[in-house]
């Protein structure tokens, strides 16, 4: 695959995560209940990180947020926090990428510049993907694990039933939600992946350049990597030879410092 | 915590007219359902009437007709008007609330209960 197409399709799986990621954070169903089925209507519960909404056997649904902070368990606190990192580190790895991408040309930004955003972008995804993951994981942990369940409060009174307050035993399922940012987690850290891969590409390869440029008087050798003598030249007139068709080049200019070519 | 305090109660003559009161408070993220039950001395305990937040009603065989459930979901309180009362009326009438206290923390909430005499 060509570098352009892993940067292109990274970005692509990427933005498609993220998409993902908001979506699940937005989402009200990161659980659900069959509350109770009473008398008079059957409830189903459905709770976000937001707000926590009720639909009636009718169809009518109340949804109500969050208002208070205080209230909330920590690993709530917890889970929004790591969403909300996950979104903005998505963010910045968007407008990273954009700027990074190889069909975009921008000014005179040059191939290394490009790679070193790539990457950063790519680093950026890999992170804000995680975070997603461990949130939606932590979450469904908190369900498994029982940890929302209350403990049942009995107050004495009238025909063992008056002033009584009872746990209503319900039965916890993963919502949509958490699907969703598992996925969308998954895809942003595959395109992050996939951003840094295509860094790779980008920069030089230094295996391709490892031409080192002994500046001797009146002489000059440049060695291919392995020890093959690739030129020698006695007098002064051995300038800009060729090693191979890649492009690297010896330069025996009167300069004693290395130039922009000379990989050692 | 959650609290439900009811109201209203008290001795009336058949035929007569009560009007009961159910106030739930605390900490409370939503009430699906609010219910009157009843419950005579030596009898089994059963549902008068009960409404949703979304007005849905169910009423018990024997006071559909005559009473008339109602609420206030803004309050978080639910009435009970009881018309053309009968002796067999008679009895202990508890408020039974069903509550989402918050993330996952559901409560079957009752009160303690009012008493309603039917008698000449």
């Known amino acids: 695959m060509s570098v352009t197409a892993c940067q292109g399709l990274g970005f692509v799986v990427s933005l498609i995560g993220f998409a993902g990621i908001i979506a699940a954070t937005c989402m009200d169903q990161w659980s659900t209940q069959d509350l109770y089925n009473n008398p008079v209507t059957a409830v189903f519960n459905y709770q976000g990180l937001w707000r926590s909404c009720v639909r009636e056997s009718s169809g009518f649904t109340e949804c109500r947020g969050y208002f208070t902070l205080l209230g909330l368990p920590a690993m709530l606190q917890a889970v929004r926090a790591l969403m909300i990192v996950g979104i903005v580190l998505g963010v910045i790895g968007i407008l990273v990428s954009i700027f990074a991408l190889k069909c975009i040309r921008i000014g005179s930004m040059d191939d290394s510049a490009k790679a070193k955003m790539t990457l950063t972008s790519g680093i950026l995804f890999i992170i804000s993907g995680i975070c997603a993951i461990i949130g939606v994981s932590v979450f469904a942990n908190m369900l498994v694990t029982n940890f929302w369940m209350s403990t049942a409060n009995m107050y004495s009174g009238m025909g063992g039933m008056g002033g009584m307050v009872q746990t209503v035993q319900t039965r916890y399922t993963f919502g949509a939600a958490l699907f969703v940012g598992w996925v969308a987690g998954g895809l942003t850290l595959i395109g992050g992946v996939m951003m840094c891969i295509a860094c790779r590409g980008l920069t030089p390869d230094d295996s391709n350049f490892k031409a080192v440029s002994y500046h001797a008087s009146g002489q000059n050798v440049a060695y291919r990597p392995g020890g093959f003598k690739a030129s020698t030249g006695f007098g002064s007139n051995t300038r800009n030879k060729k090693i191979y068709d890649g492009g690297a080049r010896t330069e025996d200019d009167e300069q004693s410092h290395p130039t922009k070519y000379d990989y050692v | 915590e959650v609290q439900v305090v009811e109201s209203g109660g008290g001795l009336v003559q058949p035929g007569g007219s009560l009007r009961l009161s159910c106030a739930a408070s605390g900490s409370i993220l939503h009430i699906p359902v609010m219910s009157w039950y009843r419950q005579a001395p030596g009898k089994q305990r059963e549902l008068v009437a009960g409404i949703s937040t979304g007005g849905t009603t169910n009423y018990g065989d024997s006071v559909k007709g005559r009473f008339t459930i109602s609420r206030d979901n803004a309050k978080n309180t639910v009435y009970l008007q009881m018309n053309s009362l009968k002796p067999e009326d008679t009895a202990a009438y508890y408020c039974?609330?069903?509550?989402?206290?918050?993330?996952?923390?559901?409560?079957?909430?009752w009160g303690q209960g009012t008493l309603v005499t039917v008698s000449s």
């Open positions: 039974n609330v069903l509550v989402v206290s918050g993330i996952g923390s559901h409560l079957e909430v």
